[in-house]
Interface confidence: low
């Protein structure tokens, strides 16, 4: 566990005031594990939100302001915010402790290079390609077929993002069913709209949150005939490769630790996104965002 490098009594270091969720996401996306900020809740005035970079994502934890002037996060209550931060210096949130506050002016994500000129809004959009059929199992879902290109609107949850399809329909999509796309030639936004100007798959840190329903650029060469539903474990185990390291909390005996590249035998796909599996004789639960399923029809893609 990395040691914390901040003074919890220095409110100016970690309290960012009325920063939006999207702004917090932008500041923390791709930053070091354990970087955090505290902001005002935009949906519940008077409450706060602890936004944390953990496990290659940004998590947002609500901090309720109680009538007795105490602060509550999950089931824990504290007399003041510095006490809450002190607690999470040494206790895990989900996968990290609090290590350092985010800089007041966001620095570029780790491993990225600052662009000399900012991209236009359209270049800022984040696109994904769908890997499997998803019929949708909730009214809020966005159903899709394998091979569609969707634009990401918002990332409200680790495993479920809000996306828009080419018809302008918006809904929630399961992250493990898609892969991110980045433009292979980002120069000039008015390129051939029918050409496939997307590269495969590299994390895109910035994302826009447009409220319009402009259609997506069409992409030629999308596989239309081969429709692949997510494999089912009913016909035996499904194999997947770990694409993200996972170090579970030491107290969680049901969790399965993963190293990037581990081959996971998936034995059960629970609908809540916590899958059951086995690695080298170790069994346990893991979030389905941490693995990529081997596609039996495309063995070359599994490399």
């Amino acid at each position: 566990m990395s040691s914390a490098r901040f003074d919890s009594s220095d409110r100016s270091a970690w309290y960012m005031g009325p920063v939006s969720r999207q702004e917090a996401q932008t500041r923390l996306q791709g930053q070091r594990h354990g970087m955090f900020l505290v902001r005002d809740s935009s949906t519940c005035p008077g409450d706060y939100v602890l936004s944390v970079s953990e496990n290659s994502r940004v998590s947002h934890y609500i901090i309720n302001s109680l009538p007795n002037r105490r602060f509550k996060i999950g089931d824990q209550e504290f007399d003041h915010l510095p006490a809450l931060l002190e607690f999470y210096k040494i206790h895990y949130l989900d996968t990290t402790t609090l290590i350092e506050p985010a800089p007041r002016y966001p620095s570029p994500p780790m491993g990225s290079v600052s662009a000399p000129n900012l991209p236009t809004a359209e270049d800022n959009l984040e696109y994904v390609r769908t890997l499997y059929d998803f019929p949708g199992n909730d009214a809020e879902d966005l159903p899709f077929k394998k091979g569609e290109i969707l634009v990401i609107i918002e990332k409200p949850e680790e495993q479920w993002w809000s996306a828009r399809n080419k018809d302008g329909r918006v809904g929630m999509i399961p992250v493990p069913y898609v892969e991110k796309l980045v433009r292979s030639s980002p120069h000039g936004k008015h390129g051939n709209r029918n050409s496939n100007s997307y590269g495969i798959p590299e994390p895109a840190h910035a994302y826009a949150q447009p409220q319009t329903t402009t259609p997506l650029p069409a992409v030629s060469g999308s596989p239309g005939a081969a429709i692949t539903p997510l494999p089912s474990t009913q016909n035996g185990p499904v194999f997947a490769k770990a694409i993200q390291k996972r170090v579970p909390c030491a107290y969680d005996k049901t969790a399965l630790a993963l190293e990037v590249g581990d081959i996971v035998k998936v034995t059960r796909m629970n609908i809540n996104g916590q899958w059951e599996g086995e690695v080298n004789g170790r069994k346990g639960l893991f979030p389905f965002t941490h693995v990529k399923i081997f596609d039996p029809q495309n063995p070359d893609e599994n490399e």
Partner: antibody, heavy 126, light 112 residues
Framework: QVQLVQSGAEVKKPGASVKLSCKPS????????IHWLRQAPGQGLEWMGI????????SSAQKFQGRVTMTRDTSTSTIYMELSSLRAEDTAVYYC???????????????????WGQGTLVTVSS | QSVLTQPPSVSGAPGQRVTISCTGS?????????VHWYKVIPGTAPKLLIY???NRPSGVPDRFSGSKSGTSASLAITGLQSEDEADYYC????????????FGGGTKLTVL
């Protein structure tokens, strides 16, 4: 604070239509889906449909398809639900509800309805 | 006919403990969907009581607790008070239904 304020009670004749309104406040209008539910006298809660205030996309339960129309007016941040071809069994209290983040450390797969309107009683009688 | 099954009524004296069950199937609660509980007093807006099987929103007393096992869930209320008299509904989702939001038939709690 978050509130969903619904329009007042309605009395309608069979075959008519009713249009109910729901005005959310205290949060960004476009950020949360709004669902419509109803409760008939002596019956349980029943889900009717959903509207995404951002794009206007709607979806309704099979039982109500063809009879229910959900719309939104972004200029007034108001959601509407119209039910046509009313019958006596449509007599119920109609609720709008926000399905949103309760936001704690627990990751909930499908969010609950965290805020509800006060309900609108619709009476269908000849 | 509701997708989730609840007892129509339960009762208890002040200070007692009561539980309300909610039974589903492999396509809803058993499919790992979360269960949420609501308190409904006629004429007022329903109130979220328990979400994600066993979590209380802020402001809900710790006398209320939820649990889930297999294809069923339950709501427990300890130290029963007169203001607890209301209808209680469980809610989940069903993978076999397009609308997916499903409720129990509701349980009327009477405080004797």
């Amino acid at each position: 604070q978050v509130q969903l304020v619904q329009s007042g009670a309605e009395v309608k004749k069979p075959g008519a239509s009713v249009k109910l309104s729901c005005k959310p406040s205290g949060y960004t209008f476009s950020s949360y889906y709004i669902h419509w539910l109803r409760q008939a006298p002596g019956q349980g809660l029943e889900w009717m449909g959903i509207i995404n205030p951002s794009g206007g996309y709607t979806s309704s339960a099979q039982k109500f398809q063809g009879r229910v129309t959900m719309t939104r007016d972004t200029s007034t941040s108001t959601i509407y639900m119209e039910l046509s071809s009313l019958r006596a069994e449509d007599t119920a209290v109609y609720y709008c509800a926000r399905r949103g983040e309760v936001g704690t450390m627990v990751r909930v797969f499908r969010k609950p309805f965290d805020y509800w309107g006060q309900g609108t009683l619709v009476t269908v009688s000849s | 006919q509701s997708v989730l099954t609840q007892p129509p009524s339960v009762s208890g004296a002040p200070g007692q403990r009561v539980t309300i069950s909610c039974t589903g199937s492999s396509s809803n609660i058993g499919a790992q969907y979360d269960v949420h509980w609501y308190k409904v007093i006629p004429g007022t807006a329903p109130k979220l009581l328990i979400y994600g099987n066993d979590n209380r929103p802020s402001g809900v007393p710790d006398r209320f607790s939820g649990s889930k096992s297999g294809t069923s869930a339950s709501l427990a209320i300890t130290g029963l008070q007169s203001e607890d008299e209301a209808d209680y509904y469980c809610q989940s989702n069903d993978i076999s239904l397009s609308g997916s939001v499903v409720f129990g038939g509701g349980t009327k709690l009477t405080v004797l």
